[in-house]
């Protein structure tokens, strides 16, 4: 993974488009699209004033934690779908794409150095806990995925890529 590949806005746009497509196919889908349990996902709301005042390292922690939790949530969704009696094929395809996309984003963020930035404070337990919400449908899960990409992830990469250019 070239270190600055994620700094090309088209790369993030590709994953965002996939997430939006996934969200769209679940619109109005009730029968096949329930998760049948509440899955914890990151709260994608961003306080822009607080975000701008954050050190890039703290932003990296938030993004890395969010990405890890979102990945875990989509993996859980994938497992629930596999274990369901009749998985809806279009949904299965988009869930698989989301897992793959999140893995690629993990690799791209790693290459950018997000993992190095996201070192723990001296007392790891003092790290601010990630704010979370729950998703009970695939639609909500995909909406969180697309909101995370266009929110914290886009903000972080914008800042990290700009910092790296200096």
């Amino acid at each position: 993974a070239p270190p600055r590949l994620i700094c090309d806005s088209r790369v993030l746009e590709r994953y965002l488009l996939e997430a939006k497509e996934a969200e769209n196919i679940t619109t109005g889908c009730a029968e096949h699209c329930s998760l049948n349990e509440n899955i914890t996902v990151p709260d994608t709301k961003v306080n822009f004033y607080a975000w701008k005042r954050m050190e890039v390292g703290q932003q990296a922690v938030e993004v890395w934690q969010g990405l890890a939790l979102l990945s875990e949530a989509v993996l859980r969704g994938q497992a629930l779908l596999v274990n369901s009696s009749q998985p809806w094929e279009p949904l299965q395809l988009h869930v698989d794409k989301a897992v793959s996309g999140l893995r690629s984003l993990t690799t791209l963020l790693r290459a950018l150095g997000a993992q190095k930035e996201a070192i723990s404070p001296p007392d790891a337990a003092s790290a601010a806990p990630l704010r979370t919400i729950t998703a009970d449908t695939f639609r909500k899960l995909f909406r969180v995925y697309s909101n995370f990409l266009r929110g914290k992830l886009k903000l972080y990469t914008g800042e990290a890529c700009r910092t790296g250019d200096r």
């Epitope: 993974a1 914890t40 922690v61 890395w64 934690q65 990405l67 890890a68 939790l69 979102l70 990945s71 875990e72 989509v74 993996l75 859980r76 497992a79 897992v99 793959s100 999140l102 893995r103 993990t106 690799t107 790693r110 993992q115 996201a118 070192i119 723990s120 404070p121 790891a124 337990a125 790290a127 806990p129 990630l130």
Partner: antibody, heavy 119, light 107 residues
Amino acid sequence: QVQLVQSGAEVKKPGASVKVSCKASGYTFTTYGINWVRQAPGQGLEWMGWLSAYSGNTNYAQKLQGRVTMTTDTSTSTAYMELRSLRSDDTAVYYCARGVGASFYFDYWGQGTLVTVSS
Amino acid sequence: DIQMTQSPSSLSASVGDRVTITCQASQDISNFLNWYQQKPGKAPKLLIYDASNLETGVPSRFSGSGSGTDFTFTISSLQPEDVATYYCQQYDNFPLTFGGGTKVEIK
């Protein structure tokens, strides 16, 4: 720097239980998963299971289901692996390893804990 | 479960030789494959992730390629310190599985 430090060697009798600890430092513990991998003497690597340090969610290898439990204590950044009803073929070096999100590559490993099961 | 078949199980080569190890998955695993090096009495060490990405700090003589079911790990110029056992590992699906390992020795 990132470190995973495991508890010391154990000798157990068949039928007993063992609990191995793995203390993490140098990173935000809840951002990564902890995997457990074992290696019998002279053999290859066998994945035992994964534990989310954030949510506590787990996924265990089918052959160990019902005998293994993986837990964490986030206040001390420590992961635990308990294996019950030990048999002689459980004799192995047990490793904890850090994994990233849905990308299960293990970039840091503990030093290993030798568990010997013998009557 | 996805089976990972690694070959050869052992090999002996001279310092400076090009060494190639292959790993075959029993089903398509995309690029969700990693390579580890394990020296006697030590924990494994990540060398390559996502089939072809070199882990930070790993010498560039190590490389990986492949996608789908067939993967290759290469040491372009074998060094004495490369004596170890090398494992591939898939993470396309649970349970995660490792290849049987390839023991590399110096002639």
